[in-house]
Amino acid sequence: EQAPGTAPCSRGSSWSADLDKCMDCASCRARPHSDFCLGCAAAPPAPFRLLWP
């Protein structure tokens, strides 16, 4: 869980308790077991904007 008093991670990143910092979710492709990757799965990047209704 993110440390109290810290700012939330920006979109596309997730908090790592192992490193005490926000980590880029893109790195989960190479190393999916990293502790922060669970947060990436729970909050995926924003979907593409639909071009039709």
């Epitope: 192992d18 490193l19 005490d20 190393r31 077991h33």
Partner: antibody
């Protein structure tokens, strides 16, 4: 100059306890994850334990889980390893090392090591 | 757990030789592979990180390559100070890491 200096090693009987220290200098200690690695006489390197920069998260090798405790005091720039229920197979030189760039992908600075001998 | 193997265990070489050490992982570790040099009675020294990046201050005769499961450390022209034991280390499973058994480079 980055320096890591281990201390606290020595001769201890099986079942005994020992507390190792690793004093850091020459860099800001608090943002860096740290590890302990050991090397039995004439053998290779074995990872022992990991601690996050804040000290809030720790990990251990199966061989020491439940017996060793890693901790840190960022106000004193010091890393610790509390070793309980020591066994003959814990005999080794113990090194502390710093996670490079504040990550755990590689370890760029190591101490000179402190020898722990477990024997009756 | 990820197992690391190295070959050869011991390598006899002469000053000026080109030396290659191989490290193999039991599963793919991408490029999360580091190389260390250790001399007797001394701490390990980081040479190469992320499979092929040269650590600051390390001579350019050292180079690393590979990805996935197979990696190599090459010393282009062996110098007297290079006689030592070399370890590979995977950080794919970090914070838990594993080292290879080491390769001793000795004088022929």
């Amino acid at each position: 100059e980055v320096q890591l200096l281990e201390s606290g090693g020595g001769l201890v009987q099986p079942g005994g306890s020992l507390r190792l220290s690793c004093a850091a200098s020459g860099f800001t200690f608090s943002p860096y994850p740290m590890i302990w690695v050991r090397q039995a006489p004439g053998k290779g390197l074995e990872w022992v334990s990991y601690i996050s920069p804040s000290g809030g998260k720790t990990h251990y090798a199966d061989s020491v889980k439940g017996r060793f405790t890693i901790s840190r005091d960022n106000s004193k720039n010091t890393l610790y390893l509390q070793m309980n229920s020591l066994r003959a197979e814990d005999t080794a030189v113990y090194y502390c090392a710093r996670g490079g760039d504040g990550y755990f992908d590689y370890f760029d600075y190591w101490g000179q090591g402190t020898l722990v001998t477990v024997s009756s | 757990d990820i197992q690391m193997t190295q070959s050869p265990a011991t390598l006899s070489a002469s000053v000026g030789d080109r030396v290659t050490i191989t490290c193999r992982a039991s599963q793919s570790i991408s490029s999360y592979l580091n190389w260390y040099q250790q001399k007797p009675g001394k701490a390990p020294k980081l040479l190469i990180y992320a499979a092929s990046s040269l650590q600051s201050g390390v001579p350019s005769r050292f180079s690393g390559s590979g990805s996935g499961t197979d990696f190599t450390l090459t010393i282009s022209s062996l110098q007297p100070e290079d006689f030592a034991t070399y370890y590979c280390q995977q950080s794919y499973s970090s914070p838990g890491i594993t080292f290879g058994p080491g390769t001793k480079v000795e004088i022929k």
